[in-house]
């Protein structure tokens, strides 16, 4: 996949060299979540803004029904931040009844769904115990890494508790991917 | 924007294909902040090291006066980590006078300034309540995502409390961007 | 390093334009750590899975003996997440004997080793005080940034306490790098 001194006498056949600007890319931003049915035994998936404000999809990377659709096989960098906020944490009561409770927790998972494969694949997980002394708390979980994806794969972001997601600002909670 | 088997009989006109190595890129690292004037109603902006140690700017990406200057329109991945440290947190006093106080918090914002647009745009925000039992605490906030920027845009990193930024090591607090 | 309208009358000599798909890339995932000797005065390095599950190395980026080997000079994006989990934190006892203790902490460092240079270089550090009231806690530290690396450089991930690393899932603790 190289082009070298492109004189007609060369015997090589050159594979297409694509410009960076036409690679599939998306940056999605938070919207207020509405109650929906979730898959059984799976954290609920967030839905996203894909065209207003900072959000965009381009070059055949499409967003539909909580999923980013991968239009082309290759290595993608995938990232998300979810900001959580809560009013209370039972943590100070953690030793009630003489034994430690499980602490509250917040979790973000970026999940890949491949139609030909029965189970979703968890690509990235950020999980944190929440044990705040104060009456209200807020904090982000950030994730990002590179994965080899196939055309037709679908990506979504799942969270442990949709009601704790801070949906108030597009810069606080977001999800994106781009072909490398 | 593709080049295929470059024989003279081809009718296509090929747009320039740029080498990856000549794309605008920067990685800036922390320096100790000195008291300066800040924009009104905006968190203070950090200033940065741009050429010593791990820091660099290249291919027309320049740093000046707390801003990274975007030399070319396109999609950029932008990231920052700020490590905060504090010696106290009022959180243990949070229920003083029978009512909960607002918890202390730490916030990082990556902001875009476009000269033709009156208001800065907040691209990324990481914000966290700080409610530490101990007398001293430290923790990072990391941010990173992709944005479509225009030539002439300026990027800066704002923080809620400049006095809490850990300036001691270039690997703890940093800011970068690169054209995809 | 550009190729434009490749007609035979052009006098330019075109440098090779490489396809994105043949750039060095790796994504490594956590495995259970076995006790090993550590370098003196240095946090222990993690070892990684490099071919099973989500893990891969490609295009001459190799993994050997806790190190990612950089096969080609250039600008790389490097990232890691380490999820820590602990059973207790002495933090609630922080005012024992009338004076504050140093808080517990967790630290991740991405380190570069250059054979011709005597000292490793710390590229990225995420460090956090841990002062949890509850009896068990867990949380991730994420890092990522761009660095100019040389062929032959080696990258590793060091942690403050290997016994606190959550090795149970490949999506919780990982390490990667790719040439931009």
């Amino acid at each position: 996949l190289k082009g070298q001194e492109f004189a007609p006498s060369h015997q090589q056949v050159y594979a297409p060299l694509r410009a960076d600007g036409d690679k599939p890319r998306a940056h999605l931003t938070v919207v207020r979540q509405t109650p929906t049915q979730h898959f059984k035994n799976q954290f609920p998936a967030l839905h996203w803004e894909h065209e207003l404000g900072l959000a965009f999809t381009k070059n055949r990377m499409n967003y539909t029904n909580k999923f980013l659709l991968i239009p082309e096989s290759g290595d993608y960098f995938i990232y998300s931040q979810v900001t959580f906020r809560g009013m209370t944490s039972e943590c100070s009561e953690i030793r009630q009844a003489g034994r430690p409770n499980k602490p509250d927790s917040i979790t973000v998972v970026i999940t890949k769904v491949t139609d030909s494969y029965p189970e979703p694949t968890q690509l990235l997980m950020g999980t944190k115990s929440v044990c705040e002394v104060g009456s209200n708390w807020f904090q982000p979980i950030y994730l990002g890494a590179m994965f080899s994806l196939q055309e037709g794969d679908k990506l979504m972001v799942n969270v442990s508790d949709i009601s704790l997601v801070d949906y108030t600002k597009e810069d606080k909670t977001f999800f994106g991917a781009f072909l490398l | 924007l593709k080049g295929q088997e470059f024989a003279p009989s081809h009718q296509q006109v090929y747009a320039p294909l740029r080498a990856d190595g000549d794309k605008p890129r920067a990685h800036l690292t922390v320096v100790r902040q000195t008291p300066t004037q800040h924009f009104k109603n905006q968190f203070p902006a950090l200033h940065w090291e741009h050429e010593l140690g791990l820091a660099f700017t290249k291919n027309r990406m320049n740093y000046t006066n707390k801003f990274l200057l975007i030399p070319e329109s396109g999609d950029y991945f932008i990231y920052s980590q700020v490590t905060f440290r504090g010696m106290t947190s009022e959180c243990s006093e949070i229920r003083q006078a029978g009512r909960p106080n607002k918890p202390d918090s730490i916030t990082v914002v990556i902001t875009k300034v476009t000269d033709s647009y009156p208001e800065p745009t907040q691209l990324l925000m990481g914000t966290k309540s700080v409610c530490e039992v101990g007398s001293n605490w430290f923790q990072p906030i990391y941010l990173g995502a992709m944005f479509s920027l225009q030539e002439g845009d300026k990027l800066m990193v704002n923080v809620s409390d400049i006095s809490l930024v850990d300036y001691t090591k270039e690997d703890k607090t940093f800011f970068g961007a690169f054209l995809l | 390093l550009k190729g434009q309208e490749f007609a035979p009358s052009h006098q330019q000599v075109y440098a090779p334009l490489r396809a994105d798909g043949d750039k060095p890339r790796a994504h490594l995932t956590v495995v259970r750590q076995t006790p090993t000797q550590h370098f003196k005065n240095q946090f222990p390095a993690l070892h990684w899975e490099h071919e099973l599950g989500l893990a891969f190395t490609k295009n001459r980026m190799n993994y050997t003996n806790k190190f990612l080997l950089i096969p080609e000079s250039g600008d790389y994006f490097i990232y890691s997440q380490v999820t820590f989990r602990g059973m207790t934190s002495e933090c609630s006892e922080i005012r024992q004997a009338g004076r504050p203790n140093k808080p517990d902490s967790i630290t991740v460092v991405i380190t570069k080793v250059t054979d011709s240079y005597p000292e490793p270089t710390q590229l990225l550090m995420g460090t956090k005080s841990v002062c949890e009231v509850g009896s068990n806690w867990f949380q991730p530290i994420y890092l990522g940034a761009m660095f100019s690396l040389q062929e032959g450089d080696k990258l590793m991930v060091n942690v403050s306490d290997i016994s606190l690393v959550d090795y149970t899932k490949e999506d919780k603790t990982f390490f990667g790098a790719f040439l931009l």
Epitope: - | P44, R85, M87, I162 | -
Partner: antibody
Amino acid sequence: QVQLVESGAEVKKPGASVKVSCKASGYTFTGYYMHWVRQAPGQGLEWMGWIKPKSGGTNYVQKFQGRVTMTRDTSINTAYMELNNLKSDDTAVYYCATGGSQDASDFWGQGTMVTVSS
Amino acid sequence: DIQLTQSPSSVSASVGGRVTITCRASQDISIWLAWYQQKPGKAPNLLIYAASSLQSGVPSRFSGSGSGTDFTLTISSLQPEDFATYYCQQADSFPLTFGGGTKLEIK
């Protein structure tokens, strides 16, 4: 350039109160902690506490708790340190100081001499 | 509270000479130590922060080193204007505390 200008010298009787002011200029007053440090004649430096001008939050050294109050007026970029129930060993030069980080003070006021004498 | 012990409490030296002042903390303070110079009737002046970083505008003959509990301030080639009192100050944990001072006198 950054400047901290303190109020003039004071002479007070034991049991009285003193309020020292510190007017800041050349930087964003609300962006940086203001420390108060005192120095008794011929003695070393003693840190008293700080105020965060943005929120008005304070932290005082235990020794001064209940006797000291640090306040600010952001409209005139001024910090205040009030010390009550003065004793003769409160005779000292009182300094305000600020800096770009919590850990060290780049800029200091000229000092205010407070004499407590009956 | 963290105690800082400076030594010596006073030292005499000649112009052009070299002097080292030490500061010992009662517990580990990492690198959170600053050094100040104070001349009679004047406010202190920051010389060194984070144990070894030279404050802008301070001559390079001043240097700091150390971490943990043991720190030093070195003046490599004494100038007449360097004769003053020097204080260390920790900022690892609340409350901030100062050392007792070292008076540098001309020999």
